[in-house]
């Protein structure tokens, strides 16, 4: 019995639960998911019983080995998987536990302008980045377009100050989770500030 193995998969994708055994005479292998039986295998007779019929098409054993491949992953496949290898040559079963986290591929991040002010020729804008998958182990960072991979700010919200006459610089937000990353459409501080100024002028008028 080894330490818990952490696995990551993406919705619609596949994950393989690695399993090896040196036991020559394996009587049965039982896989469970959150305490519910998933698959029972008897290698000697070559019988494989998948408890729930809907899972039959999702279960496979790469190269005819003991490792279990689960495909067409869904969010609710996340959880604890446990395998027991039973053999008359073992005093107690050999076991292994896995924790599977299934994540969605990230949608394109949306950038919202939280708050803006324009004082003494300096425009202050708060940009907030979000995706439909917020809170699911999603991290955000900001970078200047054309500046290589160097991110200059970690976090969903970026506060920028743009002074009139400064060179404009496109900014993009990157959202990342364990299975994907996604970039927002670039935003231009100068344009946002000019739009904000226009809006203020029209309000005064």
């Amino acid at each position: 019995s080894g330490p818990v193995k952490e696995l990551v998969g993406s919705v619609g994708g596949a994950v393989t639960f690695p399993l090896k055994s040196k036991v020559k005479q394996v009587d049965s292998i039982v896989w469970t998911f959150n305490t519910t039986p998933l698959v029972t295998i008897q290698p000697e007779g070559g019988t494989i019983i998948v408890t729930q019929n809907r899972n039959r098409e999702r279960v496979d054993f790469p190269d005819g080995g003991y490792s279990l491949k689960l495909s067409k992953l869904k969010k609710n496949d996340s959880g604890i998987y446990y395998v027991g290898i039973y053999s008359s040559s073992l005093q107690q079963p050999s076991t292994q536990e896995y924790v599977l986290h299934v994540y969605e591929h990230l949608s394109k991040p949306k950038v919202t302008i939280d708050r803006q002010s324009n004082k003494n020729g300096t425009c202050v804008i708060n940009l907030t980045c979000s995706t439909d998958q917020d809170g699911e182990n999603v991290t955000y960072s900001w970078k200047a377009v054309g500046q290589g991979d160097n991110q200059f700010h970690d976090g969903a919200t970026l506060s920028i100050a743009w002074r009139s006459g400064e060179k404009d610089q496109a900014l993009t937000c990157m959202a990342r989770n364990p299975v994907s990353n996604s970039f927002s459409t670039p935003v231009f501080p100068q344009k946002l500030c000019e739009d904000a100024a226009t809006d203020l002028t029209s309000l005064r008028g």
């Epitope: 000697e44 070559g46 005819g64």
Partner: antibody, heavy 120, light 107 residues
Amino acid sequence: QVQLQQPGAELVRPGASVKLSCKASGYSFTTYWMNWVKQRPGQGLEWIGMIHPSDSETRLNQKFKDKATLTVDKSSSTAYMQLSSPTSEDSAVYYCARSTMIATRAMDYWGQGTSVTVSS
Amino acid sequence: DIVMTQSQKSMSTSVGDRVSITCKASQDVITGVAWYQQKPGQSPKLLIYSASYRYTGVPDRFTGSGSGTDFTFTISNVQAEDLAVYYCQQHYSTPLTFGAGTKLELK
């Protein structure tokens, strides 16, 4: 990659025993059962037996109990099958084939076969 | 010994067709059946094990089904390279036994 290498052909005199070899590579030889299968010209497949290289446990088709002896040499990852007192009935192609883990009696990798001709 | 009966000795088909080969076990083998493909001059190749599990790398046009004593092997959208002899084998108990084979030929 997994490979099972067998000599292409063996010519044997009637009554003179012959020892066929099967050299395994590309996997842990002592972890998988090794099978031997007979195929007479134009005929189907006939299972002779299987041996586990870790401890040489053998399971033999009773039909071949007086005909075939299965052995292994772990140091060279080679399985052997000796055919005793060959007759024309033993002229056939003999395959070695590795068992899968998940179904220990299904065979996923096969050698190219050794064609045995028994003739005086 | 368990007898595996493949009633069709040969079958004629055309490229693009769907063809099914049947195999009957003389006693219950649960799902302990494998299917092999053998082309002339070549060694057999494992396609299906445990009645319905496709071996790694085998195209998904090959499928297996059945349990107990009745088993079916199906090729959908037959390709020219599928012309071969197909054997069923019970891997439920020793001695392991094979069907006599079904030769797939072009019409």
